[in-house]
């Protein structure tokens, strides 16, 4: 388990309930040993994952883990959907599980739903 393979710790079936108009950071936790791999984000369109170009991304370091962050400034209703990060390491592509953003458009919601309501989706 403690190998020097690159690992991407996005959880299978994970999701985030967020609101349009808010800022949001989508994190891809990356474990690597010597050299930080090149990491990219893509958004699922059916079975195809379309690479996100020209988006604001950044790195954050925490103990023995790095995070490749996709910034939403702000979240748009069209950001609803599933995302995946992938790392290019030693000419191999390592893909994460997908994570889903459930975006509530506050214009169409009279008030923000509770966390319980969001979780029941």
């Amino acid at each position: 388990k403690e190998s020097c393979d690159v690992q991407l710790y996005i959880k299978r079936q994970s999701y985030h309930s967020i609101f349009a108009g808010d800022p949001f950071k989508l994190e891809c936790p990356v474990k690597y040993c010597a050299h930080r791999p090149q990491v990219t984000w893509c958004k699922l369109n059916g079975t195809t994952c379309v690479k996100l170009e020209g988006r604001h991304t950044s790195w954050k370091q925490e103990k023995n883990l790095s995070f490749f962050i996709l910034h939403f400034e702000p979240v748009l209703p069209s950001d609803n959907g599933s995302y995946r990060c992938s790392a290019n390491f030693l000419s191999a592509i390592i893909e994460s599980h997908s994570t889903t953003l459930y975006v509530t458009d506050v214009k169409s919601a009279s008030e923000r739903p509770s966390k319980d309501e969001m979780a029941s989706r």
Partner: antibody, heavy 121, light 112 residues
Framework: EVQLQQSVAELVRPGASVKLSCTAS????????MHWVKQRPEQGLEWIGR????????KYAPKFQGKATITADTSSNTAYLQLSSLTSEDTAIYYC??????????????WGQGTTLTVSS | DVVMTQTPLTLSVTIGQPASISCKSS???????????LNWLLQRPGQSPKRLIY???KLDSGVPDRFTGSGSGTDFTLKISRVEAEDLGVYYC?????????FGGGTKLEIK
């Protein structure tokens, strides 16, 4: 080495509530799901539900909706299972289990030693 | 819920002999990501469960290679090529493809 520490036993009166804890060492629970599993005496295993400690999102088996509440405290690396309105049917061993995720791999490696809950007047 | 049916209920085996446990699911465990989230666990007497096999056939670290997992779709098998004394306990199949996650009823392996 990853370890999950649970209290050994709890004796609770019918109608009361109880909160069981599971503390992880050797791994940050934010990068995992924490599951709870029930095992009644001389019976099989039942999945109660899970939490994503990174954001508090929970999922429960329909049978345990309303009976079980799973929470997590990332500062203490601890997950909790609260059981309400206890009856003799809730007498069981409750295991916590940690799902460890790497890139598109699935691990369900680590189990606590279990807490024996006895509901009796 | 996906029903996981294990057979046999009890298996009595002589040390050194092979053993086989079947697990059938009420629907296919092939996920949309192309993987099959089927695990095998062993619960030794008085202990918590321990996973032996994940994704149908991948052995956990430290698990002897006398254990093999196979199958696809709805039919899965755990085989032990030569049973040893430490293998006794209850074996469970467990699926994580569909919500809620479900376990088989267990197969008790006894040593003759």
């Amino acid at each position: 080495e990853v370890q999950l520490q649970q209290s050994v036993a709890e004796l609770v009166r019918p109608g009361a509530s109880v909160k069981l804890s599971c503390t992880a060492s050797g791994f940050n629970i934010k990068n995992t799901y924490m599951h709870w599993v029930k095992q009644r005496p001389e019976q099989g295993l039942e999945w109660i539900g899970r939490i994503d400690p990174a954001n508090g999102n929970t999922k429960y088996a329909p049978k345990f909706q309303g009976k079980a509440t799973i929470t997590a405290d990332t500062s203490s690396n601890t997950a909790y299972l609260q059981l309400s309105s206890l009856t003799s049917e809730d007498t069981a061993i409750y295991y916590c289990a940690l799902t460890y995720y790497g890139s598109s791999q699935y691990y369900f490696d680590y189990w606590g030693q279990g807490t024996t809950l006895t509901v009796s007047s | 819920d996906v029903v996981m049916t294990q057979t046999p209920l009890t298996l009595s085996v002589t040390i050194g002999q092979p053993a086989s446990i079947s697990c059938k699911s009420s629907q296919s465990l092939l996920d949309s990501d192309g993987k099959t989230y089927l695990n095998w666990l062993l619960q030794r007497p008085g202990q918590s469960p321990k996973r032996l096999i994940y994704l149908v056939s991948k052995l956990d670290s430290g698990v002897p290679d006398r254990f093999t997992g196979s199958g696809s779709g709805t039919d899965f098998t755990l085989k032990i090529s030569r049973v040893e004394a430490e293998d006794l306990g209850v074996y469970y199949c467990w699926q994580g493809t569909h919500f809620p996650q479900t376990f088989g009823g267990g197969t008790k392996l006894e040593i003759k």
